[in-house]
């Protein structure tokens, strides 16, 4: 089963409308908001998920210091324009004709401008740093157990190829997961690190995008791993272009 033919639902995306109107009466699911057909055997792209969301009723130190070019998603939610493949269009504009350029995870990477703003290409986010703080536990998690469980989580729940999980750092109570995926490394059918990170972020916030209503159940050697805060940094293949005014503000 992929799109759960028996009851025609999309296991990997609850923000869909499904009906048995595909070829041969097969279950076909379409994303809310865009109406685009989605592949329920893998993750739905972040752009389509954001669009659907907007359419819905309302020892040695091992931790990584994010680069000066790292982006944090401070703008939050917006109704994005997606291309026919479900990826973010390089230029995004709002209803008041304010436009900006985004990277492949939909995070703004330029100052805001008007309709004359040009975004020549969609710049790829090739490095994502997920910074987590876990709730107090009786003792620290064993680093190798934690590493193995998080890698397995990304492989099995988010279907991200293990080679794209570059590292798991742990310095109690901070956990950092590094995802890396260059354009040249990403083959057809590979889950995008941006999509995996978005599903993970929503899971951690208790807002699972999967069809099941239970939500994420993550444990390390039987001990629940409960996260109390998340920060995600995005690094692009080409550094972002912000004016000095913003950088000194």
């Amino acid at each position: 089963h992929t799109a759960a033919q028996d009851n025609c639902t999309c296991p990997t995306n609850k923000m869909t409308v499904c009906s048995p109107d595909g070829p041969g009466g097969r279950c076909q699911c379409r994303a809310l908001g865009s109406g685009m057909a989605v592949d329920c055997s893998t993750l739905t792209s972040k752009c389509l998920l954001l669009k659907a969301r907007m359419s819905a009723p309302k020892n040695a130190r091992t931790l990584v210091r994010p680069s000066e070019h790292a982006l944090v998603d401070n703008d939050g939610l917006y109704d994005p324009d997606c291309d026919p493949e479900g990826r973010f269009k390089a230029r995004q504009c709002n209803q008041t004709s304010v436009c900006w350029c985004v990277n492949s995870v939909g995070v703004r990477r330029t100052d805001k401008g008007d309709l004359s703003l040009r975004c020549d290409e969609l710049v790829r986010t090739h490095h994502i740093l997920i910074d987590l703080r876990h709730r107090p536990t009786a003792g620290a998690f064993n680093h190798s157990d934690l590493d193995a469980e998080l890698r397995r989580l990304f492989r099995e729940r988010y279907r991200l190829h293990p080679k794209f999980v570059a590292a798991v750092h742990y310095e109690q109570p901070t956990i950092q997961i590094e995802l890396r995926q260059n354009t040249s490394q990403k083959a057809a059918g590979d889950v995008d690190i941006g999509d995996a990170a978005y599903y993970f972020e929503r899971d951690i916030k208790g807002e699972s995008l999967f069809q099941g209503r239970g939500g994420l159940d993550l444990r390390v050697r039987g001990e629940p791993l409960q996260v109390e805060r998340t920060l995600i940094y995005y690094l692009d293949e080409i550094p972002p272009k912000f004016s000095m005014k913003r950088l000194t503000a």
């Epitope: 089963h1 639902t9 999967f210 069809q211 099941g212 159940d217």
Partner: nanobody, 131 residues
Framework: QVQLQESGGGSVQAGGSLRLSCAAS????????MAWFRQTLGKEREGVAI????????RYADSVKGRFTISRDGTKNTMSLQMNSLEPADTAMYYC????????????????????????WGQGTQVTVSS
Amino acid sequence: QVQLQESGGGSVQAGGSLRLSCAASDYSTGRRCMAWFRQTLGKEREGVAIIDYAGTSTRYADSVKGRFTISRDGTKNTMSLQMNSLEPADTAMYYCAAAAIPYERCPDISDPQILVSFPYWGQGTQVTVSS
């Protein structure tokens, strides 16, 4: 693709015991919620017992509480259902099922939408309890 295979069914007298087993083909079932369901002719499949991926949380249908025990062995990718004090009302085809998504918290056994969470099924094993 997750494939499940049940075994251990058979015929038994009321008050007797049986142990059903379920073998999973896929390594990733080790991190999926799993369950046993049963179905009698002309009736809807009903949840019998459910177990989380760590094997630490189990839930049972009221009709089998205190008589049936669900367990799993993550290292062998197997799950079992120990059925004691069997009654004629337990006669049914028994199916093991695996959740759609790994690392998903198990739904409640009485959730009317429970079948949505379990797209992977075995072929079933028949249990017949005679009085």
